[in-house]
Amino acid sequence: EAHKSEIAHRYNDLGEQHFKGLVLIAFSQYLQKCSYDEHAKLVQEVTDFAKTCVADESAANCDKSLHTLFGDKLCAIPNLRENYGELADCCTKQEPERNECFLQHKDDNPSLPPFERPEAEAMCTSFKENPTTFMGHYLHEVARRHPYFYAPELLYYAEQYNEILTQCCAEADKESCLTPKLDGVKEKALVSSVRQRMKCSSMQKFGERAFKAWAVARLSQTFPNADFAEITKLATDLTKVNKECCHGDLLECADDRAELAKYMCENQATISSKLQTCCDKPLLKKAHCLSEVEHDTMPADLPAIAADFVEDQEVCKNYAEAKDVFLGTFLYEYSRRHPDYSVSLLLRLAKKYEATLEKCCAEANPPACYGTVLAEFQPLVEEPKNLVKTNCDLYEKLGEYGFQNAILVRYTQKAPQVSTPTLVEAARNLGRVGTKCCTLPEDQRLPCVEDYLSAILNRVCLLHEKTPVSEHVTKCCSGSLVERRPCFSALTVDETYVPKEFKAETFTFHSDICTLPEKEKQIKKQTALAELVKHKPKATAEQLKTVMDDFAQFLDTCCKAADKDTCFSTEGPNLVTRCKDALA
């Protein structure tokens, strides 16, 4: 229903704590360079204003839209043009164009230093001094680096963070309590970020219909006992929630997500038998739990679907009468039978089915034409299955670091024009798929591998869009979202690439590498590996292995030497010479 004051409505629904958190996230995602203090001041002003509207909905400006209120706040920031350049031009526009303009200026790769975690004692001190400010800093730092992070989920991660600090800061050995727990939260949050970014890309590039198809497939896999009407209702609601969050409407998004969680918990009987444990939790934990709830037990006697979608003489009539509903039921029926398929694969199958009906229903004898449609799915099903087998076998043989290196070589050959930091980041993320998915039971590997790879490749596309350099990448990123991963997998060595000149300084290292944490050391070595491939794109795996082994040996020797600097300066040039010879 319509409310006299939107801001009062949302404040009342969400409560002060969540309201403030969401407004902070919204401002941090829009203006990514502002300091925490600047944003905290704005948040307090907005909250105070919301409270006046709660007290009197007829008070001045309380009837304004949230976009108008928030946009006016952002546009009142001093030195906006100096700090944000052309983003300041957004402020000359009226709503809704002004908000669209802000959205277009969100930066997926802001030039901000990595979010460094303070050491345990310092962290516990500042947490104990002011937990609210501490958590505010967390929300601000994550939101500005991840401008599409799913806001209600970020509140959940902040709550996790809070609980970990509360527990570990009371321990004698704070460090060993905090590190593994916070690493776990960080890893989950980063995966959540790329997954949500993929959803927003789907929404932005292909609209609500594309996202809703994704939701139907995913929900049908998770809730195979729910009927199509129920799945459609959930998919529609989930689409609205995600549209709001992707569009910067974070208060509405969080409010609607809470409503959806409430609906699911009140209708467990028609949705799934697995929801009760989630529904017993408080709001943020409940919504998070529902978003990754285990699949319900499949009905034991689902019939083959060919009868309804291939053998029925009315297929074309049913399709023509309500195309999206008919395709939706196909996607629903296929997905509920196949929790072992990735959502991307299910969407490719539905797309193939749609294309077949479009073609065949225009012909003289449609049944003869579409009669073999299910058999034509063969290459679509085989391709990702083979991908999973090949890559998991390789991961099991090489381990995570070696697997990342193999992917780095492969992707540098596919797109050598892409910047080395982007290639290294992508390869490291793609390589984590092994640890994340290849250890799972066989029937869970495909959905895990392919849907994760798709999300990582979406980030590659977003970064490449900013500065397009590779025709290969542009080609794969221009097509439909579900075709991207197969497109990237099919890429081979870019024959148009002119190899980079060999620069000795690229492969010159100093003793400071010895004190770097293991992760940073790996990144240095992987940077060198990508540069080697850019110099010799057709180097064999054996040649590259020889060079990298030599390099690792060199680091090991010099880092153990009494006079490290001398070792690096004398042995370094010898290493460079050997590398050149090995790759000649």
Epitope: P224, H295, T297, M298, P299, A300, D301, L302, P303, A304, I305, A306, V310, Y334, R337, H338, P339, D340, Y341, L374, A375, F377, Q378, V381, E382, D443
Partner: nanobody, 115 residues
Framework: QVQLQESGGGLVQPGGSLRLSCAAS????????MAWYRRAPGKERELVAL???????NYADSVKGRFTISRDYAKNTVYLQMDSLKPEDTAAYYC?????????WGQGTQVTVSS
């Protein structure tokens, strides 16, 4: 074309065990439902046990606690471990698998429980 290769049947004493296996080949699709049925002489065919993609299982009341159905996803194979066999378990056992296209039936393997 889908072929089902059943094996493991035979003659066994009451209280003994057998393991039936059924390997499916020639299908491009994962079978989302794999099952064992049986037909005793002069009786209707009955469902013994089934397993779905998500490894949920269902059993006939008469075999609960004695028989265990399992599957090897990668090999498209379904197994039936039969323990504490009774004379009334004597029957021809048929493997049944289902993908999105249709159902497929095996030729059957004979299990005889007798002393």
């Amino acid at each position: 074309q889908v072929q089902l290769q059943e094996s493991g049947g035979g003659l066994v004493q009451p209280g003994g065990s057998l393991r039936l296996s059924c390997a499916a080949s020639g299908s491009i699709f994962t079978f989302y439902r794999m099952a064992w049925y049986r037909r005793a002489p002069g009786k209707e065919r009955e469902l013994v046990a089934l397993i779905t993609t998500d490894t949920s299982t269902n059993y006939a009341d008469s075999v609960k606690g004695r028989f265990t159905i399992s599957r090897d996803y990668a090999k498209n194979t379904v197994y039936l471990q039969m323990d504490s066999l009774k004379p009334e378990d004597t029957a021809a056992y048929y493997c049944n698998v289902r993908n999105v296209e249709r159902d497929y039936w095996g030729q059957g393997t004979q299990v005889t429980v007798s002393s």
